[in-house]
């Protein structure tokens, strides 16, 4: 298949540390034109991380995902991996992108292969305009605060690219299971697909086991510290950005030839006090916060801003 220009559109300056393959649903290589080869891993929560293809865990993860994809294909599933160019799909990202990661979709007039979009139920958390992202801008994303003591290999730090859409008309990043989006702090935007009308607070969720290896995207994250696992119901000990409405009409008319540019700006704001105490032992934030995006239909640009995820900081005790 002809992809048009093969300009590098995802640059990974920092690679993630280990992620269990159980939590991964997909992988993809970046383009040869990027110079530094990287594997783009998609997690069950539909977030993307750069990984070093030379690392053994990455090789093992890819091998496992290959087998899983083959098994699902035999069983009539739709799990899919893609090898080759990472090209944005027709809809730009609204999720975390980070650590000198630059996404530059090219207008080839073709249907793109990567379509990061937010879920329609996700909270509006975005910031206005920003300067364009230079390679080398340091952001932070993800939500893992590693336990202490910890071996030298910390959690995936500053490597998350963006959240890809839980449901999409394009098939290249589709996993074997549908995603019912839960509450989160990613920017909201309209898409051409109808949002779920289910009330997450009242409707009981049901699931059975028709096939093995179903992938369960999940919202909400717990943050670790001091080798402990308390979970306050709503505690947040990291900076949180105040709510800013996202442009909710931005995704409506993006076609295959649309251009998107990514910018990153640092954000500082006040923290929210915990409602419940965190168990003994302090925990220190790691540079791994989700990045929030908003779309400007005039500029056809994606603004990415690092914002701590309140859900991510949620712990229970």
């Amino acid at each position: 298949q002809h992809h048009g220009v093969t300009k590098c559109n995802i640059t990974c300056s920092k690679m993630t540390s280990k992620i269990p393959v159980a939590l991964l649903i997909h992988y993809q290589q970046n383009q040869a034109s990027c110079g530094k080869r990287a594997i783009i891993l998609e997690t069950r929560q539909h977030r993307l991380f750069c990984a070093d293809p030379k690392e053994q865990w990455v090789k093992d993860a890819m091998q496992h995902l290959d087998r899983q994809a083959a098994a699902l294909t035999r069983n009539g599933g739709t799990f899919e991996k893609q090898i080759g160019e990472v090209k944005p799909r027709t809809t730009p990202a609204a999720g975390g992108m980070d650590e000198s990661v630059v996404l530059e979709p090219e207008a080839t007039g073709e249907s793109s292969s990567l379509e990061p979009t937010p879920s329609s139920q996700e909270a509006q958390r975005a910031l206005g305009t920003s300067p364009e992202l230079p390679t080398g801008v340091t952001g932070s994303s993800g939500t893992r605060l590693p336990p202490t003591p910890k071996a030298q290999d910390g959690g995936p730090v500053g490597t998350e690219l963006f959240r890809v859409p839980p449901v999409s008309t394009a098939a290249t990043w589709q996993s074997s299971a549908p995603h019912q989006p839960g509450p989160s702090l990613w920017a909201e935007a309209k898409t051409s697909e109808a949002p779920s009308t289910q009330d997450p607070s009242t409707q009981a969720s049901t699931a059975s086991s028709p096939a093995p290896e179903e992938n369960a995207p999940s919202e909400g994250q717990r943050v670790w510290g001091q080798g402990q696992s308390p979970r306050p119901e709503n505690s947040l000990e990291r900076e949180e950005m105040g709510p800013v409405p996202a442009h909710t009409d931005a995704f409506q008319d993006w076609g295959p030839g649309s251009m998107a540019h990514v910018s990153v700006v640092p954000v500082s704001s006040e923290g929210t006090p915990s409602r419940e105490p965190v168990a003994s032992g302090s925990w220190t934030p790691k540079a791994e916060e989700p990045i929030h995006a908003t779309m400007d239909p005039q500029r056809l640009g994606v603004l990415i801003t690092p914002v701590p995820d309140a859900q991510a900081a949620t712990r229970r005790q």
């Epitope: 269990p20 992938n215 995207p217 696992s229 979970r231 005790q317």
Partner: antibody, heavy 122, light 107 residues
Framework: EVQLVQSGAEMKKPGATVKISCKAS????????IHWVQQAPGKGLEWMGW????????RFNERFKGRVTITADKSTNTAYMELSSLRSEDTAVYYC???????????????WGQGTTLTVSS | DIQMTQSPSSLSASVGDRVTITCRAS??????LAWYQQKPGKAPKLLLF???TLAEGVPSRFSGSGSGTDYTLTISSLQPEDFATYYC?????????FGGGTKLEIK
């Protein structure tokens, strides 16, 4: 304090269906994975499947495929595990447990229910 | 599926002893391993997880080591309350699997 409280012991006949509940408290129910683990008498532990309340996309151990249904009632913070077509080898203690949902940490089980004993006998 | 083989299956020791339990995976699990302690009639309790991190409230006499496929749980100085059954669990890939257990008894 995090607590997972399971329903009481069950006695069932082969071919029947059992539904075990796991009521969670002390944390935001919809934010954490719930797992079910089986422990047959004198045997080790066997993972049955995971579920995130609020999602409809669980994952199961192939061994239990087709016989397990997991549901959740968010209004009562309760997860359920239903096992059908019971046979004598399903006699075991069933535990619910939670794991971190930070997608980079992995699923180790940090909190457990007290267990529900299921006896399957004709 | 990754099989987890624990050894020994049972072990007799005295208070104050140093005890080592090993767990071997049938494939690489990249340090995504947890150790649990279970006492009769009780649910398992998390001791250690990824990269040998001690869980909340677990005494420092418990430690873990290993990489690749071979892992070890060490209790540096056995206490009376440590006599129990110990399980390892890999969470690198699904289905998550446990070792067969090591029953630690008083000599």
């Amino acid at each position: 304090e995090v607590q997972l409280v399971q329903s009481g012991a069950e006695m069932k006949k082969p071919g029947a269906t059992v539904k075990i509940s796991c009521k969670a408290s002390g944390y935001t129910f919809t934010n954490y994975n719930i797992h079910w683990v089986q422990q047959a008498p004198g045997k080790g532990l066997e993972w049955m499947g995971w579920y995130l309340p609020g999602d409809d996309s669980p994952r199961f151990n192939e061994r239990f495929k087709g016989r397990v249904t997991i549901t959740a009632d968010k209004s009562t913070n309760t997860a359920y595990m239903e096992l059908s077509s019971l046979r004598s080898e399903d006699t075991a203690v069933y535990y619910c447990a939670t794991s971190p949902t930070d997608e980079t940490q992995g699923d180790y089980f940090d909190y457990w229910g007290q267990g529900t004993t299921l006896t399957v006998s004709s | 599926d990754i099989q987890m083989t624990q050894s020994p299956s049972s072990l007799s020791a005295s208070v104050g002893d140093r005890v080592t339990i090993t767990c071997r995976a049938s494939g690489r699990i990249h340090d995504f391993l947890a150790w649990y302690q279970q006492k009769p009639g009780k649910a398992p309790k998390l001791l250690l997880f990824t990269d040998n991190t001690l869980a909340e409230g677990v005494p420092s006499r418990f430690s873990g080591s290993g990489s690749g496929t071979d892992y070890t749980l060490t209790i540096s100085s056995l206490q009376p309350e440590d006599f129990a059954t110990y399980y390892c669990q890999q969470f690198w890939s699904t289905p998550y699997t446990f070792g067969g257990g090591t029953k630690l008894e008083i000599k």
